[in-house]
Interface confidence: low
C-alpha cells in the first residue's frame, strides 16, 4: 500500500523484504513464463512517408532539433523488411512480440475516418505472421509517434480532447486486430511523454520548462489510458478476451547513507514522483500520490471523486519498464540527491509492496551499446544476465509476480534523444546498408540459450 | 489513547549528567510509521528541538548540542531515553518528548502528540 | 543550517482573521507544520503538511505554502485562540527538525 514501499531501503531484517541476498541464482523461471522481445515502431519501421504514413511529432523533432540525423527514412526499415524481422524472432524462439503501432500509419491525420489501407495491410501482415508461428502479439496503442496533426491543430496531450480522439484511434485497433491480440499495452512510458516532452525539451515535442503543462499532459495521458481501458473491458473483453495495461517506467535509487531515515524518505519520495504519478490513480487508490498532491497543489490537475473511481483499477496487470531512457538523463528533481541504482530486483519488489503484489510484466528490460559496437556486444550479455538474475530472485526468493520478460530491443534502431549514437538491438543492423541485414548479436544467441533453457542452468 | 509521559529529575548539578524517560502507550515504538523527538523550552523562549529516534533506531541530533546528547529506545518497555551531559544554568527549562508519525510515504506528518513536559532547573 | 523566520507577534480583533507567516528559503519544497502552544501548556499541532488539520481542530485553522512562505490563517479569531504559535519542519539536508522562533498572537 502507498509508502509501503519504504521498507525496502531498510537495512534492519526485521523490515526488509528482500528475504535473501545472493549474487547468482541457478535456477529456472516459472514453467509457463512468458519470453519475450520488443521494438517501437518510431525506432524501427523507417518509411516515414511512404504509402500514404503521415509524419509524427517525433518525424517533425527529428527535423527541427536532431540537425545531425537525417530522418528516419533508414532506421531498420522494418517496415519494408517485415519478413527479416520475423526471421530474427524465430531465430531467438520468444513466446510474444511485443511491438507498437504508428497512429499516422494508420490515421495520417490523427483522426479516426477511414484507415491508410497500406498501414492497415503491414500491421494485418504482421499480426497473421505472428499467430502463424505461435507469437503471442502485445501491441501498444502509443509509443510517443503522435500525428503531428494532432500536434498542430489541438497541442497535442495538452488538450484533452486528445483523449476521445485516442480511444477512437484504440477502438478502431481492437475491431481490426482484437481478434488476434490478448495483450494490449494502451502508452508507452508516459513519464518520459510528460516530462521530456514538455519538460526538459529533450524528445518530442520540444517544449521545455513549463510544469503546469508537464502535469497536464500527464493528467491527460492518465485519462486518455483509462479511458481505452474501460472501452476495451466494456465493448471487446466479453468476447476477445484479452488483457490491457499501460508500461510505466521507472528508474531505481538508493539512498546516500543507508541508515538515514531521511534519505530513505527521499528516495521513496523519487519513485512516487515518477512511477508513483502514474501507478497510483490506475494501480493504487485512483488518485495521484499524497505527497505529489501537496507539493504540486499549484500545477498537478485534480481528480474529482467520480474520476478517482474511473482510474482505479484500470490495467489487468502491472507493465514495468526498466531501461536506460528512465536513467539518462534522469531527472534532477527526481533524484533528490540520491544515487541512481540498476536494482531491478528491489525496484520490483517495490512494486509488490506499493501496489499490493500485482501481477507483473517486465515489458522493456535492457541496456544499450556504443553505436560502434557490431555483433560482439559482450556489455549487453553482462547486462542481461545481472537484469535475468534480479527478476529470478525477486521471483524465487521474494514470491513476486512476474510472469513475463521482455528484452529490449530485437533491433538495433532510432534512440530517441541518442539517435543512432547507441544500440539496442539484439541484432545488429547496418543502417548504411540496402538490404539492412539482421545479424545476431552475441546477446541473441545468449537470449536463445536462457529461453530455451527457461533460465540458467548450471 | 495515544500518551506520551517525561520523568526525571526536577533539579540537577552543573556539570552533572541529566537523564530522562519517555514513556509511551497506545503505539508501538517498533512501528515502521513512528518517531519520537525531544524537545526543550527555556522560560519565555521559543520550542528548541533536541533529538529524534526513528522506528529503525536511527538517531539525529541537534547539531549545537550534539556532542552532549544520548537518545536511545528500549521498545519493550516503550520508553525513550534522553542522556544530557555537562549541565549548565542555561540548561533550565521544559523538557518535552512529542511523536511524529510518517504518513504518504516519505515524509513526518508534524509532532502529533506531546507530553505534558517536565520542568528541568539547573542550579548548585 | 536551516532557518524558519516567524514574526514575534500578530494583534487581531475578535471575529477578524489572522495570518502568520513563516520565512525560509524555498519553503513551498518542504512540509510545514504549526503548532499551538498556550501559557503553560505543551504544544498542540493545530495543521500539518502545510494545510492539513488534525482531528478536533477548528475549520478556522488552514495553512498554505509556496515559494518563501508558508502561512498559518485563523478565521473569525476567537479570545481563546490567544497563543504562541510555532511553524516547524524537518530539514532533509541535515536531517534536523527546526522550529521557527514563534509568533505571539493577541486578540484584541
Known amino acids: 500500500f502507498s509508502g509501503d514501499g519504504r521498507a525496502i531501503w531498510s537495512k534492519n531484517p526485521n523490515f526488509t523484504p528482500v528475504n535473501e541476498s545472493q549474487l547468482f541464482l541457478y535456477d529456472t523461471f516459472p514453467k509457463n513464463f512468458f519470453w519475450g522481445i520488443g521494438t517501437g515502431a518510431l525506432q524501427v519501421e523507417g518509411s516515414w512517408k511512404k504509402d500514404g504514413k503521415g509524419p509524427s511529432i517525433w518525424d517533425h523533432f527529428i527535423h527541427t532539433h536532431l540537425k545531425n540525423v537525417s530522418s528516419t527514412n533508414g532506421s531498420s526499415d522494418s517496415y519494408i523488411f517485415l519478413e527479416k524481422d520475423l526471421s530474427a524472432l524465430d531465430f531467438i524462439g520468444v513466446s510474444f512480440y511485443q511491438f507498437s503501432i504508428s497512429w499516422p500509419r494508420l490515421f495520417p491525420d490523427g483522426i479516426v475516418t477511414v484507415a491508410n489501407a497500406k498501414g492497415l495491410q503491414y500491421y494485418s501482415t504482421l499480426l497473421d505472421a505472428l499467430v502463424l508461428r505461435n507469437i503471442e502479439p502485445i501491441v501498444t496503442l502509443y509509443h510517443w509517434d503522435l500525428p503531428l496533426a494532432l500536434q498542430e491543430k489541438y497541442g497535442g496531450w495538452k488538450n484533452d480532447t486528445i483523449i476521445d480522439i485516442f480511444n477512437d484511434y484504440a477502438t478502431y485497433c481492437f475491431q481490426m486486430f482484437g481478434d488476434r491480440v490478448k495483450y494490449w499495452i494502451t502508452i508507452h512510458n508516459p513519464y518520459l511523454v510528460a516530462w521530456h516532452g514538455y519538460g526538459t525539451g529533450m524528445h518530442a515535442p520540444g517544449e521545455k520548462g513549463n510544469l503546469a503543462a508537464v502535469y497536464t499532459v500527464g493528467h491527460n495521458l492518465i485519462k486518455a489510458h483509462s479511458k481505452v481501458w474501460h472501452n476495451y473491458n466494456t465493448h471487446f473483453r466479453p468476447h476477445q478476451k484479452g488483457w490491457l495495461s499501460i508500461t510505466l517506467g521507472s528508474h531505481w535509487i538508493e539512498p546516500n547513507r543507508s541508515e538515514n531515515t531521511m534519505d530513505i524518505f527521499k528516495c521513496q519520495q523519487s519513485m512516487v514522483s515518477v512511477l508513483g504519478w502514474f501507478a497510483n490513480p490506475i494501480h493504487g487508490d485512483g488518485d495521484y500520490p499524497e505527497g505529489m498532491r501537496k507539493k504540486l497543489f499549484s500545477v498537478l490537475p485534480i481528480f474529482s471523486e467520480a474520476e478517482k473511481h474511473e482510474m482505479r483499477g484500470t490495467a489487468d496487470f502491472f507493465a514495468f519498464s526498466f531501461g536506460p531512457n528512465n536513467f539518462k538523463p534522469l531527472n534532477t528533481m527526481a533524484k533528490m540527491g540520491q544515487n541512481v541504482s540498476l536494482n531491478l530486483r528491489e525496484a520490483l519488489n517495490w512494486i509488490k509492496l506499493e501496489y499490493n503484489n500485482p501481477r507483473i510484466l517486465i515489458a522493456e528490460n535492457g541496456w544499450f551499446t556504443d553505436s560502434r559496437v557490431k555483433t560482439e556486444d559482450t556489455t549487453a550479455i553482462y547486462m542481461m544476465k545481472n537484469f535475468l538474475s534480479q527478476v529470478l530472485q525477486a521471483i524465487r526468493l521474494d514470491e513476486i509476480r512476474v510472469f513475463g520478460y521482455t528484452a529490449w530491443s530485437l533491433l538495433d534502431g532510432f534512440e530517441w534523444q541518442d539517435a543512432y549514437t547507441i544500440r539496442r538491438g539484439l541484432f545488429y543492423v547496418d543502417f548504411n546498408s540496402k538490404q539492412k541485414e539482421r545479424k545476431p548479436k552475441s546477446s541473441a544467441h545468449y537470449y536463445k540459450q536462457i529461453i530455451r533453457e527457461n533460465g540458467f542452468s548450471l | 489513547q495515544v500518551t506520551l509521559k517525561e520523568s526525571g529529575p526536577v533539579l540537577v548539578k552543573p556539570t552533572e549528567t541529566l537523564t530522562l524517560t519517555c514513556t509511551v502507550s497506545g503505539f508501538s515504538l517498533s512501528n515502521a510509521r513512528m518517531g519520537v523527538s525531544w524537545i526543550r523550552q527555556p522560560p519565555g523562549k521559543a520550542l528548541e528541538w533536541l533529538a529524534h529516534?526513528?522506528?529503525?533506531?536511527?538517531?539525529s541530533y541537534s547539531t549545537s548540542l550534539k556532542n552532549r546528547l544520548t537518545i536511545s529506545k528500549d521498545t519493550s518497555k516503550s520508553q525513550v531515553v534522553l542522556i544530557m551531559t555537562n549541565m549548565d544554568p542555561v540548561d533550565t527549562a521544559t523538557y518535552y518528548c512529542?511523536?511524529?508519525?510518517?504518513?504518504?510515504?516519505?515524509?513526518?506528518?508534524?509532532?502529533?502528540?506531546w507530553g505534558q513536559g517536565t520542568t528541568v532547573t539547573v542550579s548548585s | 543550517s536551516y532557518v524558519l523566520t516567524q514574526p514575534p507577534s500578530v494583534s487581531v480583533a475578535p471575529g477578524q482573521t489572522a495570518r502568520i507567516t513563516c520565512g525560509g528559503n524555498n519553503i513551498g519544497s518542504e512540509s510545514v507544520h504549526w503548532y499551538q502552544q498556550k501559557p503553560g501548556q505543551a504544544p498542540v499541532l493545530v495543521v500539518y503538511?502545510?494545510?492539513d488539520r488534525p482531528s478536533g481542530i477548528p475549520e478556522r485553522f488552514s495553512g498554505s505554502n509556496s515559494g518563501n512562505t508558508a502561512t498559518l490563517t485563523i478565521s473569525r479569531v476567537e479570545a481563546g485562540d490567544e497563543a504562541d504559535y510555532y511553524c516547524?519542519?524537518?530539514?532533509?539536508?541535515?536531517?534536523?527538525?527546526?522550529f521557527g522562533g514563534g509568533t505571539k498572537l493577541t486578540v484584541l
Open positions: 529516534i526513528f522506528s529503525n533506531d536511527e538517531k
Open positions: 512529542a511523536r511524529s508519525v510518517v504518513t504518504g510515504g516519505y515524509y513526518y506528518d508534524g509532532m502529533d502528540v
Open positions: 503538511d502545510d494545510s
Open positions: 516547524q519542519v524537518w530539514d532533509g539536508n541535515s536531517d534536523h527538525v527546526v
